[in-house]
Interface confidence: low
Amino acid sequence: EAHKSEIAHRYNDLGEQHFKGLVLIAFSQYLQKCSYDEHAKLVQEVTDFAKTCVADESAANCDKSLHTLFGDKLCAIPNLRENYGELADCCTKQEPERNECFLQHKDDNPSLPPFERPEAEAMCTSFKENPTTFMGHYLHEVARRHPYFYAPELLYYAEQYNEILTQCCAEADKESCLTPKLDGVKEKALVSSVRQRMKCSSMQKFGERAFKAWAVARLSQTFPNADFAEITKLATDLTKVNKECCHGDLLECADDRAELAKYMCENQATISSKLQTCCDKPLLKKAHCLSEVEHDTMPADLPAIAADFVEDQEVCKNYAEAKDVFLGTFLYEYSRRHPDYSVSLLLRLAKKYEATLEKCCAEANPPACYGTVLAEFQPLVEEPKNLVKTNCDLYEKLGEYGFQNAILVRYTQKAPQVSTPTLVEAARNLGRVGTKCCTLPEDQRLPCVEDYLSAILNRVCLLHEKTPVSEHVTKCCSGSLVERRPCFSALTVDETYVPKEFKAETFTFHSDICTLPEKEKQIKKQTALAELVKHKPKATAEQLKTVMDDFAQFLDTCCKAADKDTCFSTEGPNLVTRCKDALA
């Protein structure tokens, strides 16, 4: 139904707390350099205005669209051009072009310092002093670093953060209570960020149809007892929610997500037997819980997929009659039978099935032509299964850090032109797949591994788009989203690359490395490893291991030395010489 005042409608639906949080996220995602105080001031102004519209929907400007209202606020910021350069040109445009312009200027890799967590005592003091401001800072800092973070889900993580602080700040040993819990939230939030970015990429590059196909596959796996009409309805609603969030329409997105959660809980009988626990929770927890609910038990009497999609004499007629519905039902039927496959794999199979029908239905004897299609799926299924086995075996042998290093070597050889910080970030993220997925039961490994890798590689593609340097990466990133991971996996050593000359300063370290946290130490060592591979792209695993072991020994020795500086300055050059010799 149409509302006289959109802003009043959303304020009433969402309530003041969520309304303010979402507006803060929206502004922080659009203008990523502004301080918290600048954004907090705008949020308060927007909220005060919304309240006047709630009181009187006919008041001045209350009938304006949210894009108009928010865009006008952003464009009124002083020194916009000085701080944001050409983004200020967006303000010369009219809606909807102005909002599109803002979206295009979102920066996936803003030059902001890492989000440092204050020490426990200081955190608890500022949290107790003003919990609202404290959580506002959290929303602002995460949103500006992750401009496509799923806004209602960020509110959920802020709520988690709040609960952890409330609990731990009351304890004697705040540090040991906070650290593991906040690390857990951070890890989950970072995974949520790359997953959502992948969804927005799908929407931006390939449109709603592509996202809806992803949703049909995912929902069919989770709710195998829901019929096709139900899955289609849920996929349509989920597509709308994600389109809104990816498009910066965060109030509408959060409101529609709440509606979808309400619908699912009211229609559990037709969707899944596993929803009740989620439905008993309050809104943010409920929606989060539903998004990762366990798969329902598969119906026991599902007929073989071949009956309707291969053996039926009417396949081509049915396909021609309504292509999208026919392919949608194929994807639904295949996905509900295969919770053990990744969504990416299911979409590749559906694509293969579509291509087969396109080819075969134009031939003289279609059934003879498409009769072998299910057998032709086999290599497509085997490839990711082998990938999972090989990589999980390697992870179990090397542990997370060693596994990250193996991936770093592999990817530096595939794309040595990519900047070392990007390669290190990608390898560290890709390497976490081991800890995240390889410990799961066998039937959950493949979907976990492949869908996670796809999301991480999407980030690699986004960063590479800004400054394209590798033809290998460009080739893999230009194709469809579901083909990216197999494309990257198939890449070999880039033979066109001219090795980097050896620079001693790249491998020169100082005593300050000794006091760094373990994670930072690892990053320093991995940076050196990537540089070694760029210098010698065809170095063997043994050569690289020799050098890295020597390097680790050098750090250990010098960091334990009485005079660390002298040790680094005298032993460092010897290490460099040994490295050069080992790689000669």
């Epitope: 039926d312 009417e314 039902t329």
Partner: nanobody, 115 residues
Framework: EVQLVESGGGLVQPGGSLRLSCAAS????????MSWVRQAPGKGPEWVSA????????RYAESVKGRFTISRDNAKKTLYLQMNNLKPEDTAMYYC????????GSQGTQVTVSS
């Protein structure tokens, strides 16, 4: 848009008969197996019967075997359920569904068996 519209329900005495119909539109009816599902007041949905896309393979729940017959007319895009020797425990809302699931995505038709 996928639509399933059931009809033919009503009030009948024990031992009586009814024939339910389900008119399908918005998808290629002849490509899909179909089912009948029912839901009694205060109970979860219960799968009743299923038929494959061509109409050759039919399945029934133990509770209705020998009394109910499922059939389809692909030309008319219609699914049927012939119910004979009805019992009070057959009282429920009846739904047709795509595939072989216990979910319902339509309005259903009420069947009441009572003396």
């Amino acid at each position: 848009e996928v639509q399933l519209v059931e009809s033919g329900g009503g009030l009948v005495q024990p031992g009586g008969s009814l024939r339910l119909s389900c008119a399908a539109s918005g998808f290629t009816f002849g490509s899909f197996g179909m089912s009948w599902v029912r839901q009694a007041p205060g109970k979860g949905p219960e799968w009743v019967s299923a038929i494959d896309s061509g109409g050759a393979d039919t399945r029934y729940a133990e509770s209705v075997k020998g009394r109910f017959t499922i059939s389809r007319d692909n030309a008319k895009k219609t699914l049927y359920l012939q119910m004979n020797n009805l019992k009070p425990e057959d009282t429920a809302m009846y739904y047709c569904t795509i595939g072989r699931s216990t979910s319902r995505g339509s309005q259903g038709t009420q069947v009441t068996v009572s003396s």
